[in-house]
């Protein structure tokens, strides 16, 4: 058993049918010695008396808010949560496996640049009685500071019969140098509590591996005289690290017909312009990627050919 | 400790092309190592990230773009002295700081070159003959060093009398390649910045 926060405790259980569970001793936080009784949640049934209460915690029915009273007055509370270990592996019931980029990916994180700011998000089908708390650091043995905000519900989607809820959090490394070469990964830890179930999820990454630039901005077309060709130009996104000559991007320019089946023409360039043939009803899209370190491509920025 | 904007004339910067070749070569070699050594811990998540140049060179700090010198987090640099007469400098106006930066890059390349050559000698003794260093990568390191053209003491190739532990050697190869790729990215950024300035 360990303390998650004041008066909230996590009991770790080896989870299998007929498991013996864990013996837990609760102590009433009071100078009083006599006349103390214990109850669980809203029930008025007295579970025991005395300054300490010994319970055998086996299942969720044994978890909850234990309260010690004296003469109708509440003295203190202890909330017991359960953390299930199923055949040596901690349970992952609360969050959905996003399966990208690999199986068992519960937290996904992205950064728009090298400033040390990043966003993580996760999915669940649970809509109520759910709380998250996020901590982060650079490295784990001698951790350096990363400050995270509160996790917020950022999207709701309908997936088949189920509703899916996306939560996200923004974090910022306290002293980040954009040019630094990372040797210690960022660690992100999410505590999830659903009713009386506790779970924790972690992700470890280097900022350089989660870079996804914003799409190029100010995408414009300039027709070339007496030609079906157009000059496409764009700019680096505002959110990208500066100076751009040091933090350079490379670009992919795509001409896509109305039908998804039509052949796509693609050009790769390090410049912020390109000359392409603009077909009728086609659109031109441009996306960006770090020129020197192949992390994710940005989303496409698009303009119609007409 | 930073790169001023007054740098060589446009088109007078032969190192950019070499640094791009270097990044391509080390990335290809790393990919080959990850595929060939699939049963070894060779992915970024599995290896320890060690920098063999730590406390010996200070490339990131010495080559910091001027715009980032206002960022205090970038300025906790270690002072290191370098020889400063390189041919990539193609302009008499080149500052001392830039020379320091390029000589730091040269020292990095020299250290990695020695490590890779020592390692290759060990890998050639492996009866499994599972993996060797790409000669192209070693040649590209050499080309960039020649383009930088710094006079520096030759570091003798390390020789070991004991029987090599091939498993450890292959894991060390992965660690070196990961670190060298990260350094090659920094070198490419620096060359791009200098070329544009």
């Amino acid at each position: 058993i360990w303390e998650l926060k004041k008066d909230v405790y996590v009991v770790e259980l080896d989870w299998y049918p007929d498991a013996p569970g864990e013996m837990v001793v609760l102590t009433c936080d009071t100078p009083e010695e006599d006349g103390i009784t214990w109850t669980l949640d809203q029930s008025s049934e007295v579970l025991g008396s005395g300054k300490t209460l010994t319970i055998q915690v086996k299942e969720f029915g044994d978890a909850g808010q234990y309260t010690c009273h004296k003469g109708g007055e509440v003295l203190s509370h202890s909330l017991l949560l359960l953390h299930k270990k199923e055949d040596g592996i901690w349970s992952t019931d609360i969050l959905k496996d996003q399966k990208e980029p690999k199986n068992k990916t519960f937290l996904r994180c992205e950064a728009k640049n090298y400033s040390g700011r990043f966003t993580c998000w996760w999915l669940t089908t649970i809509s109520t009685d759910l709380t998250f708390s996020v901590k982060s650091s650079r490295g784990s043995s001698d951790p350096q500071g990363v400050t995270c905000g509160a996790a917020t519900l950022s999207a709701e989607r309908v997936r088949g019969d189920n509703k899916e809820y996306e939560y996200s959090v923004e974090c910022q490394e306290d002293s980040a140098c954009p040019a630094a070469e990372e040797s210690l990964p960022i660690e992100v830890m999410v505590d999830a509590v659903h009713k009386l179930k506790y779970e924790n999820y972690t992700s470890s990454f280097f900022i350089r591996d989660i870079i996804k630039p914003d799409p190029p901005k100010n995408l414009q077309l300039k027709p070339l005289k007496n030609s079906r060709q157009v000059e496409v130009s764009w700019e680096y996104p505002d959110t990208w690290s500066t100076p751009h000559s040091y933090f350079s991007l490379t670009f992919c320019v795509q001409v896509q017909g109305k039908s998804k089946r039509e052949k796509k023409d693609r050009v790769f360039t390090d410049k912020t312009s390109a000359t392409v043939i603009c077909r009728k009803n086609a659109s031109i899209s441009v996306r960006a990627q770090d020129r020197y370190y192949s992390s994710s491509w940005s989303e496409w920025a698009s303009v119609p050919c007409s | 400790r930073n790169l001023p904007v007054a740098t060589p004339d446009p088109g007078m910067f032969p190192c950019l092309h070499h640094s791009q070749n270097l990044l391509r070569a080390v990335s290809n070699m790393l990919q080959k190592a990850r595929q060939t050594l699939e049963f070894y811990p060779c992915t970024s998540e599995e290896i320890d990230h060690e920098d063999i140049t730590k406390d010996k060179t200070s490339t990131v700090e010495a080559c910091l773009p001027l715009e980032l010198t206002k960022n205090e987090s970038c300025l906790n640099s270690r002072e290191t002295s370098f020889i400063t007469n390189g041919s990539c400098l193609a302009s008499r106006k080149t500052s001392f700081m830039m020379a320091l930066c390029l000589s730091s890059i040269y020292e990095d390349l020299k250290m990695y070159q020695v490590e890779f050559k020592t390692m290759n000698a060990k890998l050639l003794m492996d009866p499994k003959r599972q993996i060797f260093l790409d000669q192209n990568m070693l040649a590209v390191i050499d080309e960039l060093m020649q383009a930088l053209n710094f006079n520096s003491e030759t570091v003798p190739q390390k020789s070991s009398l004991e029987e090599p532990d091939f498993y450890k050697t292959k894991i060390k190869l992965c660690i070196l390649l990961h670190a060298f790729r990260i350094r090659a990215v920094t070198i490419d950024r620096v060359m791009s910045y200098l070329n544009a300035s």
């Epitope: 080896d14 989870w15 049918p17 592996i89 | -």
Partner: antibody, heavy 115, light 112 residues
Amino acid sequence: QVQLVQSGGGVVQPGRSLRLSCAASGFTFSSYGMHWVRQAPGKGLEWVAFIRYDGSNKYYADSVKGRFTISRDNSKNTLYLQMKSLRAEDTAVYYCKTHGSHDNWGQGTMVTVSS
Amino acid sequence: SYVLTQPPSVSGTPGQRVTISCSGGRSNIGSNTVKWYQQLPGTAPKLLIYRNDQRPSGVPDRFSGSKSGTSASLAITGVQAEDEADYYCQSYDRGTHPALLFGTGTKVTVLG
């Protein structure tokens, strides 16, 4: 006392369907994940499928994906394996088993796919 | 499709020490715990060892398990006639959990 009693095995022709059941007692069935494991005659153990305690997630071996469906009825304390498009290579003894560091197995039920 | 490799058979005379190996990789045994099962002819498998080296109550202490790196082993010290059975190791793969990975199985024969 934890008990898993299996039923539903038998002889079936290739291409036909069969549904196996596993009735649980002696524990809170709705709190635990469950597996199906099979063993072809004279061969080793092969995992078939898994279902979470609440039925929210199901996982299958590649060899049965798209043909077999694992399900549970927590109100009846019963686990099911619906097998469709059966093949000769599905002939085996099928076991249900609880998920956990200490597990309990059903007695097994024989499924024979033969024309 | 077995990723955990066991010797097909091992044998010993009563009282001898018999060991069975189970060889895997970094993503399975290297990252997860190992179980061992005993299966007597015509019966369901019985758990002998869980969490690499733990014995459930009721399992004789002549059975012991260990794990090192990407392989595990089961030892029977002082093998007895009633130990003649098939033995299977089981683990998980970190990418496909909760799918159970079983070893190929080992037939233990007690001679004499």
